[in-house]
Interface confidence: medium
């Protein structure tokens, strides 16, 4: 707690400017009006305040807004955001995507901090769902964001938002997460033609059921082995040799290299040897 002291004569700050870097922390507390600070927050980032001075500025804002900062202040926090605790952030009501972007920019290049996680949580809850623009923004800053959500949280993602998802955003998703996302992707891309549909749905196929894989096998999609290896084992097992051959197209030869790995290993064991022999790959059931 900074001790309350009178502002020295002639030091009352008429605006937030460079001269304040020469103020001791008790002078900042005594001579800077909190309401002035709130209206000129955008200037703070241009001034080389020490971390100690930023503590004082934060303290002033906390006193002015004990129930939480208004969005007009939050949007211009800049690197003062790094001083906020998750408890501070839980008091905020952030509705503007521009505000979210401005604060994520401050933390750019770093791992997601507890502050950022809290901010995102508050923002998404405030919006009621993870809409496309929000998802676009979050995955741009944190490619692994989507896969950090629980299946329950993912269930609030509307199909329209799936258009914002890039293949790399799903790299760390587990099967339970893909189980939730796949039906949404299927719905989102349903009006696309065969080859375009496959390009879009490919990275979500780890959540696809057998019947959808059977349908894809009829469309000359030429699925690569990397995608095939990420499919659910229980979805692959019922596929016939002919269906897998059609599904993989020219990539079917890659099965040999993967014959000891799931789901290929389990699938091979389920097939008749005569059927496997038709592939000419020397696969042994």
């Amino acid at each position: 707690e900074v001790e309350k002291t009178a502002c020295p004569s002639g030091k009352k700050a008429p605006e937030i400017d460079e001269s304040l870097i020469f103020y001791k922390k008790w002078e900042l507390e005594a001579c800077v009006d909190a309401a002035l600070l709130a209206t000129q927050m955008d200037r703070v980032n241009a001034i080389p305040f020490t971390y100690e001075q930023l503590d004082v500025l934060k303290h002033k804002l906390d006193e002015l807004y004990p129930q939480g900062y208004p969005e007009s202040v939050i949007q211009h926090l800049g690197y003062l955001f790094l001083k906020m605790s998750p408890e501070d952030i839980r008091k905020w009501n952030v509705t503007s995507l521009e505000t979210l972007k401005a604060l994520l920019e401050v933390n750019k290049g770093h791992e997601m901090s507890p502050q950022v996680a809290t901010l995102i949580d508050r923002f998404v809850k405030g919006r009621g769902q993870l809409d496309k623009d929000t998802l676009d923004t979050l995955t741009a800053f944190y490619p692994g964001y989507l896969c950090s959500l629980s299946p329950e949280e993912l269930s609030s993602v509307p199909p329209s938002s799936i258009w914002a998802v890039r293949p790399q955003d799903l790299d760390t998703c587990d099967p339970r997460q893909l189980d939730v996302l796949y039906p949404k992707a299927r719905l989102a891309f349903q009006n696309m033609n065969g080859s375009e549909y496959f390009v879009k749905i490919q990275s979500f196929l780890g959540g696809a059921p057998t019947e959808d894989l059977k349908a894809l096998s009829q469309q000359n999609v030429s699925m690569d082995l990397a995608t095939f290896m990420k499919l659910r084992t229980d979805a692959v097992l019922p596929l016939t040799v002919a269906e897998v051959q059609k599904l993989l197209g020219p990539h079917v030869e890659g099965l040999k290299a993967e014959e000891r790995h799931r789901p290929v290993r389990d699938w091979i064991l389920r097939q008749r040897q005569d059927d496997l022999d038709t592939l000419g790959l020397g696969l042994q059931g």
Partner: antibody
């Protein structure tokens, strides 16, 4: 990647001045602070001051006020430190460092040796 | 000014050891402590800031801890390339001040 390239070694006379430069590359120069640090032979590190290249705002260690002047040229992404009225006590290696991404002293220049000798 | 004291100027260690370097501030610095590594002929390198946050690219065998006035840098599994001089620094209030340094040497 972030790099800070400092000017070469200087041999200067007592009572004169010297200007050390620190050219930044690999990031937006005006976004982050540049710190200056002194190290005398066999001694520890001493903070001289900091400049915000975007605004020109500075803050000095009281000990170096009147001795060091920090400036920055946005057009060339270069920070400067001028040392005046040099004495043998000013013979040292001077480092610039960038508070890149708000990590304190995140990246350092290679250092500039200043030798004050008659 | 805040004084940062590294009580050990030298520490003997072996490859594979767990090493802890300590630093004491003359007043509470609210976890605003950084650690730097310096090898002969090189500039200091930032390892840790805000007492425990690892800087980009720093191996996870380096960890920082502490609060108030007492701070520690720990190397969980000493490697030959970690032989260097280590400085603590407070980045809480100006003038920012550094500890005198702790040099790690091979036993």
């Amino acid at each position: 990647q972030v790099q800070l390239q400092q000017s070469g070694a200087e041999l200067v006379r007592p009572g004169t001045s010297v200007k050390v430069s620190c050219k930044a590359s690999g990031y937006a120069f005006t976004n982050y602070l540049i710190e200056w640090v002194k190290q005398r032979p066999g001694q520890g590190l001493e903070w001289i001051g900091v400049i915000n290249p975007g605004s020109g705002g500075t803050k000095y260690n009281e000990k170096f006020k009147g001795k060091a002047t920090l400036t920055a040229d946005k057009s060339s992404s270069t920070a400067y430190m001028q040392l005046s009225s040099l004495t043998s006590e000013d013979s040292a290696v001077y480092f610039c460092a960038s508070d890149y991404d708000y990590d304190p002293f995140a990246y350092w220049g290679q250092g500039t040796l200043v030798t004050v000798s008659a | 000014d805040i004084v940062m004291t590294q009580s050990h100027k030298f520490m003997s260690t072996s490859v594979g050891d767990r090493v802890s370097i300590t630093c004491k501030a003359s007043q509470d610095v609210s976890t605003a402590v950084a650690w730097y590594q310096r090898k002969p002929g090189q500039s200091p390198k930032l390892l840790i800031y805000w007492a425990s946050t690892r800087h980009t690219g720093v191996p996870d065998r380096f960890t920082g801890s502490g609060s108030g006035t007492d701070y520690t840098l720990t190397i969980s599994y000493m490697q030959a390339e970690d032989l260097a001089l280590y400085y603590c620094q407070q980045h809480y209030s100006t003038p920012y001040t550094f500890g005198g340094g702790t040099k790690l040497e091979i036993k």
